[in-house]
């Protein structure tokens, strides 16, 4: 008799999820000498333990504690780059500017980036058919709780000047419901963080508007200022040139506005 299985609204666990997590862990620890001590099998066991046999709408931050402990990693607190709805450019930037870090440049972020996972209550099976959608099903699902947990911790780690890359092509350049807007902004520590500097990335080549005057950016400025953190904003009119100038700052064309 086929066993009844809960149908969720979101896509199922990424295929070959266990192998992917383990392989990513091995690769990361090989590339980053300071993380060579990490036992990747233990990391996978802790990751699995956070969601296997648990109802996928009933996951808590405590479920991820063993994984978080194994994934402890010191990041330079004044070199943190947050992002919202513009992940690819943020990652391209930190690949060039090697001393800056996005969450996905840390072990835990690297392990889970672009993956989906969930289990089923009372069985040791991974659900490859469907997983809960944050809006349609429940917010306390394995993926959402993971990112909320690591994002909170990443924001808490920040100090001095924190940068955030925002997508100027979106209707809400700053979105209060994004991970940045709902978690990271509220977990920056005013006693440690002096300034949040937003980089608004323009999409159109002929777009010369000052997107730092956008109402949602003003909303972000208001939230940040109320938390006793200074706010500054820069337009990045030409993201392609911006990256090029990060690679080659001596280039003569890099003295003009980008």
């Amino acid at each position: 008799v086929p066993r009844w299985r809960q149908q969720w609204s979101g896509p199922g666990t990424t295929k070959r999820f266990p192998e992917t997590v383990l392989a990513r862990c091995v690769k990361y620890t090989e590339i980053h000498p300071e993380m060579r001590h990490v036992d990747c099998q233990s990391v996978w066991d802790a990751f699995k333990g956070a969601f296997i046999s648990k109802h996928p709408c009933n996951i808590t931050e405590e479920d991820y504690q063993p994984l978080m402990k194994l994934g402890t990693q010191t990041v330079p607190c004044n070199k943190i780059l947050l992002w919202s709805r513009i992940k690819d450019l943020a990652h391209q930037f930190t690949q060039v500017q090697r001393d800056m870090f996005t969450l996905e440049d840390t072990l835990l972020g690297y392990l889970a980036d672009d993956l989906t996972w969930c289990g089923e209550f009372n069985t040791s099976k991974i659900n490859y058919q469907s997983c809960p959608d944050w809006r349609k099903d429940c917010s306390n699902n394995p993926v959402s709780v993971f990112w909320k947990t690591v994002s909170r911790r990443f924001a808490e780690a920040a100090c001095d000047v924190v940068h955030v890359m925002l997508n100027g092509s979106r209707s809400k350049i700053f979105d209060k419901n994004s991970t940045f807007g709902s978690v990271e902004v509220h977990n920056l520590q005013p006693e440690k963080v002096q300034t949040l500097e937003a980089w608004v990335i323009h999409g159109g080549r002929e777009d010369s508007r000052d997107l730092c005057q956008d109402p949602t950016i003003k909303e972000l400025e208001s939230i940040i200022s109320k938390r006793n953190i200074q706010f500054s904003c820069k337009n990045i009119y030409r993201p392609d040139k911006f990256l090029q100038c990060v690679k080659n700052p001596e280039d003569s064309s890099c003295t003009s506005e980008i």
Partner: nanobody
Framework: QLQLQESGPGLVKPSETLSLTCTVS??????????WGWIRQPPGKRLEWIGS???????DYNPSLKSRVTISVDTSKNQFSLKLSSVTAADTAVYYC????????????????RGQGTLVTVSS
């Protein structure tokens, strides 16, 4: 509940070495769950991170103070200490010891727990 308490002289002469101790209660200083550090706040200025010591025994210091700072741990007394050499009037500040959870991505500046602070004045 973890508690931290700073102790040491409130007055230090210029060019001498400032020595402070932090006593930890409610948890073991040698636990892999925590890392420890020192921060300070000069009068009218922002908090400044001085340095930290990790479970592995490795240390991390603020580059601007690195040549003058030493942080060490005494597990038998459940304490960690700060030594800051060649002090000047600019080192006058409230000094805090702090603790942080070893939990996911962490900054060098521990901010999960903090002592109440002790004022150190550098003056002859």
């Amino acid at each position: 509940q973890l508690q931290l308490q700073e102790s040491g002289p409130g007055l230090v002469k210029p060019s001498e070495t400032l020595s402070l101790t932090c006593t930890v209660s409610g948890g073991s200083i040698s636990s892999s769950s925590y890392y420890w550090g020192w921060i300070r706040q000069p009068p009218g200025k922002r908090l400044e991170w001085i340095g930290s010591i990790y479970y592995s025994g490795s240390t991390d210091y603020n580059p601007s103070l690195k040549s003058r700072v030493t942080i060490s741990v005494d597990t038998s007394k459940n304490q960690f200490s700060l030594k800051l050499s060649s002090v000047t009037a600019a080192d006058t500040a409230v000094y805090y010891c702090a603790g942080g959870y070893n939990y996911g991505p962490v900054g060098q500046w521990p901010s999960d727990y903090r002592g109440q602070g002790t004022l150190v004045t550098v003056s002859s």
